[in-house]
């Protein structure tokens, strides 16, 4: 068990703070909830603190919750591939560029680390080149979320990881908006981290609303499990 992994044996409170600017539309989001890495479970509620969110909530899911991949459930035989927990408590910097097909792109930079007993994800997001009547600024996405696989590989040069995946957002007219994600994570501290073999995270997300919440918000339930690395030969002969 890595030293960081010991911090995730129970339920951990989570705070998320985002400052965004998409095509000049500025906004802020605050989120809170908890994560339980034993089950790879995240429960979070996000509120736009600046009024109405200028982009659809589903376009921010990867920035919020795929931001705290340290809550992913890594099976016993894969624990030595869990970069995310091994970087804690000092944490990691997570940078992404997200390309929306035939529309604009988001760039994000986040610091994910423990502040006391709370896991905090502080994010800066900048969006450019969006079409004012497109699927994103035109709010044409359905309020739901598909399952995805998130592919992880070691980046030995940067002592971190590189992550690639494509998100499929459902559009109201029945078509799909693709979002091509490129991600890199680097540790904040200078302690040792686990550099993984290639594997993937399998994600399932459910979006809902709080009937008692008047502000623009999103409620998120997510399960994330690591996969893609088989048991070693020694496991087979036990």
């Amino acid at each position: 068990m890595s030293k960081g992994e010991e911090l995730f044996t129970g339920v951990v409170p989570i705070l998320v703070e985002l400052d965004g600017d998409v095509n000049g539309h500025k906004f802020s989001v605050s989120g809170e909830g908890e994560g339980d890495a034993t089950y790879g479970k995240l429960t979070l509620k996000f509120i736009c603190t600046t009024g109405k969110l200028p982009v659809p909530w589903p376009t921010l899911v990867t920035t919020f919750s795929y931001g705290v991949q340290c809550f992913s459930r890594y099976p016993d035989h894969m624990k030595q591939h869990d970069f995310f927990k091994s970087a804690m408590p000092e944490g990691y910097v997570q940078e992404r560029t997200i390309f929306f097909k035939d529309d604009g792109n988001y760039k994000t930079r986040a610091e994910v680390k423990f502040e006391g007993d709370t896991l905090v994800n502080r994010i800066e997001l900048k969006g450019i080149d969006f079409k004012e009547d497109g699927n994103i600024l035109g709010h044409k996405l359905e309020y739901n979320y598909n399952s995805h696989n998130v592919y992880i590989m070691a980046d030995k040069q940067k002592n971190g990881i590189k992550v690639n995946f494509k998100i499929r957002h459902n559009i109201e007219d029945g078509s799909v908006q693709l979002a091509d994600h490129y991600q890199q994570n680097t540790p904040i501290g200078d302690g040792p981290v686990l550099l993984p073999d290639n594997h993937y995270l399998s994600t399932q997300s459910a979006l809902s609303k709080d009937p008692n919440e008047k502000r623009d918000h999103m409620v998120l339930l997510e399960f994330v499990t690591a996969a893609g690395i088989t048991h070693g030969m020694d496991e087979l002969y036990k």
Epitope: T97, K126, K166, Q183, Q184
Partner: nanobody, 115 residues
Framework: DVQLVESGGGLVQPGGSLRLSCAAS????????IGWYRQAPGKQRESVAL???????TYGDSAQGRFTISRDDAKNTVYLHMDDLVPEDTAVYYC??????????WGQGTQVTVS
Amino acid sequence: DVQLVESGGGLVQPGGSLRLSCAASGEIASIIAIGWYRQAPGKQRESVALITRSGMITYGDSAQGRFTISRDDAKNTVYLHMDDLVPEDTAVYYCNAKKVSFGDYWGQGTQVTVS
């Protein structure tokens, strides 16, 4: 760092075609997408077309149906094929390379004049 060199601009008649080239060199492993932007006199810079490392292609409104972006990985070059050019396409065309983190790389630009 990444260096970008554009070529292929020039003067063309309305209805004509041009092919712009953008040759990339340097730390190209850090690049996740290369695209073209343009800026006409007195106007804001606008996105024309973009191709990501995975091959996903995106076109701006002005390019849809008339322009085609492609790449030659062996030559580390991205092309913009422009057909049915109109005077409104007159602009300086810039090559842009994106990395994962904040900050992009830009070329010096190549002038396209449709007249």
